[in-house]
């Protein structure tokens, strides 16, 4: 898909930081999502995994931002081939993994 501009990526990173900072209560009531191969996948795959979570206001902005990075409409399960060994993880861990991945991309200058 199209490469998101650097500013949009930074805004997404900042939003993920807002969600996770000093947070110990389970995000989205401990909802589980598919663990994904972020390196092989990307924004659309991350959105696909989070699409399964509904009624969680904490990640609604993240879902909207990810959809802006994805060139086509994503439906749940669309990228099931990129799920990691059919493993599910908590939303909080998914967000932390995504955050680290996006920082790595940013530092490597892939979106500058």
């Amino acid at each position: 898909g199209p490469v998101p501009p650097s500013t949009a990526l930074r805004e997404l990173i900042e939003e993920l930081v807002n969600i996770t900072q000093n947070q110990k209560a389970p995000l989205c009531n401990g909802s589980m999502v598919w663990s994904i191969n972020l390196t092989a996948g990307g924004f659309c795959v991350a959105l696909d995994s989070l699409t399964n979570v509904s009624g969680c206001s904490a990640i609604e902005k993240t879902q909207r931002m990810l959809s802006g990075f994805c060139p086509h409409k994503v439906s749940a399960g669309q990228f099931s081939s990129l799920h990691v060994r059919d493993t599910k993880i908590e939303v909080a861990q998914f967000v932390k993994d995504l955050l680290l991945h996006l920082k790595k991309l940013f530092r490597e200058g892939q979106f500058n």
């Epitope: 930074r10 900072q21 947070q23």
Partner: antibody, heavy 126, light 109 residues
Framework: EVQLVESGGGLVKPGGSLRLSCAAS????????MSWVRQAPGKGLEWVGR??????????NYAAPVKGRFTISRDDSKNTLYLQMNSLKTEDTAVYYC?????????????????WGQGTTVTVSS | SYELTQPPSVSVSPGQTARITCSGD??????AYWYQQKSGQAPVLVIY???KRPSGIPERFSGSSSGTMATLTISGAQVEDEADYYC???????????FGGGTKLTVLG
Amino acid sequence: EVQLVESGGGLVKPGGSLRLSCAASGFTFSNAWMSWVRQAPGKGLEWVGRIRSKIDGGTINYAAPVKGRFTISRDDSKNTLYLQMNSLKTEDTAVYYCATDQVGAYYGDYYGMDVWGQGTTVTVSS
Amino acid sequence: SYELTQPPSVSVSPGQTARITCSGDALPEKYAYWYQQKSGQAPVLVIYEDTKRPSGIPERFSGSSSGTMATLTISGAQVEDEADYYCYSTDSSGNHGVFGGGTKLTVLG
């Protein structure tokens, strides 16, 4: 060795200004969130404010008593944190500490303010 | 503004267990951190994220949290543990830090 060294403290009259600096070494400063904390004579610790790393948005937050008077900034090229203090009041008299708020932030870890400087003393008096 | 409440003082005899509490409305969802400050020195982190101990901190220091209360426990307190202890956390937004008022731990020699 991770180290923070504050400087710039001194005696200033009420209404005056002062700029504190905090020189960092031994870690990747640009990755770290940095905080200022103060301690009035014989009193407890008081959080002053914090600045995130630029990659985390560079957001700055302040405690209510200093908002609008104090400004936190950073220069990642110089590994230095700053606290610009304007319209100083006698109640701002304190030892001011800088602290790393998130050395492991880039890796998704959070350790709290795990490294502190030795502090620099600010006295506001007429 | 958000507050964390600690007892002003706690006294124990050497070898006894000291418990210092910290209460705050956001503690069910935000982690607590504990700092030790000895006279004339900068604070030292002794517990982070409620229960974790940084390297170099003796095993007798431990932390726990339940509901709106976080607790620092020093099992077998020693004379060198005499210091001021502060809890730290953030408000519910996570954007503003706050310290408790501090607890003076006296280890009666």
